[in-house]
Interface confidence: low
């Protein structure tokens, strides 16, 4: 899928628009709100009933080149005891984050926008079981 | 920036870090995953700690529909069903990188933006804060 | 589930499971196996995008493996063992197996024996 053009008949094309080159983008990698922060609850990883973990994924041709992804730790979920009800099930809540993807061909370098699925944290659910015969 | 390994063949001139703008390539990869978590899943329902999906949208970002989750209740879903105050239910945030129109309107020219989500909730154990 | 019976410990079986039904984007199948009296144990599962997961007393004698066209999962083990002894049962769940299955639920297929004597 291409990124889609501004569909609105509303949305003139403005003149002071840079020139690009045909099946491209000019794509300004300095990121708005680069300083924002998280501000989830603390520690609801560990105080989570489907708590998670996390690994960092380094890749040194993406930017960023850092993204986190988080795994749950049991199957099923904690109990009010504190042991695990394999009644109910973690599972993972996934979300799609943009990319910038840097490829090396010889001695040109070309860029690529990339949707990545990160899994964010784990929520506990029934299961639904689709049994076989 | 990020250092990346260079080919030792090519001629220095090359930046090792990203540049500040770049040019894209207008086709995006993986760009076939399904962006409406309803139909991927209906965890949203299923939790124990449920949340609500709503739309927010704004032609001039991409992608341009991004669905935002909002707990249903302060508690969470016991067996019986019934919601338990002893526990709480917590969005998951996360931030995730979207393409803003850059000068605004333009079609094919766009900066990074950080934006704050929040992805779904997950039941937790209150942090309860005695006062003397 | 097929594909079960008794055989000699060292030898090999091969179990099947024909599945329908599930329509999630992300999914995840597997085996899991109970013995008399004991607790139900998670064997080998395998997610929609075909990574593999495995208990530890299988790894490296059984391999989950599955035929998308005919919509089958199967679990060839070798190197069978007295312990492996158990009725086998496959399931499929929406969602991520890290680990594989050991579902809760008593709602399941018929499973198929297998018992290994030494």
């Known amino acids: 899928r291409k990124i889609p053009k501004v569909g609105h008949t509303f949305f003139q094309k403005p003149e002071s628009c840079p020139p690009v080159p045909g099946g491209s983008m000019k794509l300004d990698i300095g990121i708005i709100n680069e300083n924002q922060r998280v501000s989830m609850s603390r520690n609801i990883e560990s105080r989570s009933t489907s708590p998670w973990n996390y690994t960092v994924t380094w890749d040194p041709n993406r930017y960023p080149s850092e993204v986190v992804q988080a795994q749950c730790r049991n199957l099923g979920c904690i109990n009010a005891q504190g042991k695990e009800d394999i009644s109910m099930n973690s599972v993972p809540i996934q979300q799609e984050t943009l990319v910038v993807r840097r490829k090396h061909q010889g001695c040109s370098v070309s860029f690529q926008l990339e949707k990545v699925l990160v899994t964010v944290g784990c929520t506990c659910v029934t299961p639904v079981i689709h049994h076989v015969q | 920036g990020i250092t990346i390994p260079r080919n030792p063949g090519c001629p220095n001139s090359e930046d090792k870090n990203f540049p500040r703008t770049v040019m894209v390539n207008l086709n995006i990869h993986n760009r076939n995953t399904n962006t409406n978590p309803k139909r991927s899943s209906d965890y949203y329902n299923r939790s124990t700690s449920p949340w609500n999906l709503h739309r927010n949208e704004d032609p001039e970002r991409y992608p341009s529909v991004i669905w935002e989750a909002k707990c249903r209740h302060l508690g969470c879903i016991n067996a019986d069903g019934n919601v338990d105050y002893h526990m709480n239910s917590v969005p998951i945030q996360q931030e995730i990188l979207v393409l803003r129109r850059e000068p605004p309107h333009c079609p094919n020219s766009f900066r990074l933006e950080k934006i704050l989500v929040s992805v779904g909730c997950t039941c937790v154990t209150p942090i309860v804060h005695h006062v003397a | 589930e097929s594909g079960g019976g008794s055989v000699q410990a060292g030898g090999s079986l091969r179990l099947s499971c024909a599945a329908s039904?599930?329509?999630?984007?992300?999914?995840?199948m597997g085996w899991f196996r109970q013995a008399p009296g004991k607790e139900r144990e998670g064997v080998a599962a395998?997610?929609?995008?075909?990574?593999?997961t495995y208990t530890d007393s299988v790894k490296g004698r059984f391999t989950i493996s599955k035929d998308s066209a005919k919509n089958t999962l199967y679990l060839q083990m070798n190197s069978l063992k007295p312990e492996d002894t158990a009725m086998y049962y496959c399931?499929?769940?929406?969602?991520?197996?890290?680990?594989?299955?050991?579902?809760?639920?008593?709602?399941r297929g018929q499973g198929t024996q297998v018992t290994v004597s030494s």
């Open positions: 395998m997610n929609s995008d075909g990574t593999t």
């Open positions: 399931a499929i769940l929406d969602g991520y197996c890290y680990r594989p299955i050991r579902t809760g639920y008593h709602d």
């Open positions: 039904g599930y329509t999630y984007r992300s999914y995840c």
